[in-house]
Interface confidence: low
């Protein structure tokens, strides 16, 4: 007996061939001997089966002795043995219809679980293997679970169902909802404008939800909500914004925030959360701000940084085109009685300069100039 595997919702074509290459009488029946369809001369006739409106044949093939049974919009319950009667012969075809669905929405938040459920006909014992977009293979029976979805799990999952040494392939598009970056750090000189960007790692037709940026300034004892906003069909509207600092928010995606100027009291860490409509849980992105200030007071030239710096970062003070006068893994360095010239304060990581502030030291009778 020939076995054919079909996919729920798809169309299948069961073949039946006569030895004579001409149009002759044929009938397709199910295992209960109920007629599905056949012919009367050049006309297609249908029987009283449940497939009535979904069954068809390809009349153009009859003259070649081919009498296919086409079943559209397959259902699991269409799984059956179908019998083609032609030229006093009977050809039997076993059709097994499978379905594979994601347990919930195919748009899932980063960190959530994906469960794929296989629908199969009674008596079948299929095995399933799925391959994620990042090439990870998972095997299972009626259900397959993947916990802690990552950004790389976004894309097309290819699942193969094996039964009777035949296979059928399913493709399911999964969208992992997340920000492109889990964390970012911005380095700015005091007084500079600060741009924070929160690009999303997915695109959807309509995006609705609400968000908030909580900020923990290094100098503050507790965190503070800097801005709350709504997102409606990808359009951003601010609900509440603190007076200090007065953030400006872009009205279009990607989410974009502007801090008019970097000040030591703003240095710290923020957490932007985005709650999407009809989704449980929130998207998160951490953002950090490091602020540098170079000053000269009387005979002391000081360079300071505020904010979440790594212990391996080096802070240096050097006269332009000269060796560093002072270089420490600390958040403040200074030089007493600095000589006149353009001094550079540098924050660097393994020799790579992350932030630089210049201050001009004038001869002792003058006051310093900050370019």
């Amino acid at each position: 007996k020939k076995v054919v595997l079909g996919k729920k919702g798809d169309t299948v074509e069961l073949t039946c061939t006569a030895s004579q290459k001409k149009s002759i009488q044929f009938h397709w029946k199910n295992s209960n001997q109920i007629k599905i369809l056949g012919n009367q001369g050049s006309f297609l006739t249908k029987g009283p089966s449940k497939l009535n409106d979904r069954a068809d044949s390809r009349r153009s093939l009859w003259d070649q002795g081919n009498f296919p049974l086409i079943i559209k919009n397959l259902k699991i319950e269409d799984s059956d043995t179908y019998i083609c009667e032609v030229e006093d012969q009977k050809e039997e075809v076993q059709l097994l219809v499978f379905g594979l669905t994601a347990n919930s929405d195919t748009h899932l938040l980063q960190g959530q679980s994906l469960t794929l459920t296989l629908e199969s006909p009674p008596g079948s014992s299929p095995s399933v293997q799925c391959r994620s977009p990042r090439g990870k293979n998972i095997q299972g029976g009626k259900t397959l679970s993947v916990s802690q979805l990552e950004l790389q799990d976004s894309g097309t999952w290819t699942c193969t169902v094996l039964q009777n040494q035949k296979k059928v392939e399913f493709k399911i598009d999964i969208v992992v909802l997340a920000f492109q970056k889990a964390s970012s750090i911005v380095y700015k000189k005091e007084g500079e404008q600060v741009e924070f960007s929160f690009p999303l790692a997915f695109t959807v037709e309509k995006l609705t939800g609400s968000g908030e940026l909580w900020w923990q300034a290094e100098r503050a004892s507790s965190s503070k909500s800097w801005i709350t906003f709504d997102l409606k069909n990808k359009e951003v509207s601010v609900k509440r914004v603190t007076q200090d600092p007065k953030l400006q928010m872009g009205k279009k995606l990607p989410l974009h925030l502007t801090l008019p100027q970097a000040l030591p009291q703003y240095a710290g860490s923020g957490n932007l959360t985005l709650a999407l409509e009809a989704k449980t849980g929130k998207l998160h992105q951490e953002v950090n701000l490091v602020v540098m200030r170079a000053t000269q007071l009387q005979k002391n030239l000081t360079c300071e940084v505020w904010g979440p710096t790594s212990p391996k970062l080096m802070l240096s003070l050097k006269l332009e085109n000269k060796e560093a006068k002072v270089s420490k893994r600390e958040k403040a360095v200074w030089v007493l009685n600095p000589e006149a010239g353009m001094w550079q304060c540098l924050l660097s990581d393994s020799g790579q300069v992350l932030l630089e502030s210049n201050i001009k030291v004038l001869p002792t009778w003058s006051t310093p100039v900050q370019p």
Epitope: K234, E235, V236, S237, V238, V241, K246, Q248, M249, G250, K251, K252, H256, T258
Partner: antibody, heavy 120, light 107 residues
């Protein structure tokens, strides 16, 4: 020099169509939302439509929805306004303008305008 | 749509005068408002963005203030070239809405 130059205006009968163009130069056109704004004779300014950097989002004032279509060709640094089913009340000078990057930043660069007259 | 009410619709003043034009929004719009100057036969020119930020190249005699629903444009000392029509623009949400305009004339 940052510049916007409109063209395509003219006299058209009610119910007719017209296509306005705006050529941009001196800035990265594909990085900006763009708007069309019009001004009827002796009247104030009215925002008509705008379009996202990549053309994927478009917004219109209610009075032109379904009749006007804003589009852009970033390869040609050009903005367009296809105007169909024109009415007498569409008579105006049409300006193309560069949208500011953030809400509240308005439109910072404008063209000189092109005149559309709808009359029988 | 949010309505913008600009006043006065016209204003006569002399060179050296200090003048203020106001715009009121029908609901709170933070500081998402710009001010424009337009001279006859010319395109509008952005003066103030985000309610109070002076656009590059605009003289410092122009200033803007306000947030929420009430906004104002002030010209501290009128110059001959300032006689024009002024518009406020809300671009907080769609549709963008201009005020009706204020025509500033020489007294």
């Amino acid at each position: 020099e940052v510049q916007l130059v409109e063209s395509g205006g003219g006299l058209v009968q009610p119910g007719g169509s017209l296509r306005l163009s705006c050529a941009a130069s001196g800035f990265t056109f594909s990085s900006y939302w763009m708007s069309w704004v019009r001004q009827a004779p002796g009247k104030g300014l009215e925002w008509v439509a705008n379009i996202k950097e990549d053309g994927s989002e478009k917004y219109y004032v209610d009075s032109v929805k379904g009749r006007f279509t804003i589009s852009r060709d970033n390869a040609k640094n050009s903005l367009y306004l296809q105007m169909n089913s024109l009415r007498a009340e569409d008579t105006a000078v049409y300006y193309c303008a560069r949208d500011g990057s953030y809400s509240g930043y308005g439109m910072d660069v404008w063209g000189q305008g092109t005149t559309v007259t709808v009359s029988s | 749509a949010i309505q913008m009410t600009q006043s006065p619709s016209s204003l006569s003043a002399s060179v050296g005068d200090r003048v203020t034009i106001t715009c009121r929004a029908s609901q709170g719009i933070r500081n998402d408002l710009g001010w424009y100057q337009q001279k006859p036969g010319k395109a509008p020119k952005l003066l103030i963005y985000a309610a109070s930020s002076l656009q590059s190249g605009v003289p410092s005699r122009f200033s803007g203030r306000g947030s929420g629903t009430d906004f104002a444009l002030t010209i501290s000392s009128l110059q001959p070239e300032d006689f024009a029509t002024y518009y406020c623009l809300l671009d907080y949400n769609y549709p963008y809405t201009f005020g009706q305009g204020t025509r500033l004339e020489i007294k």
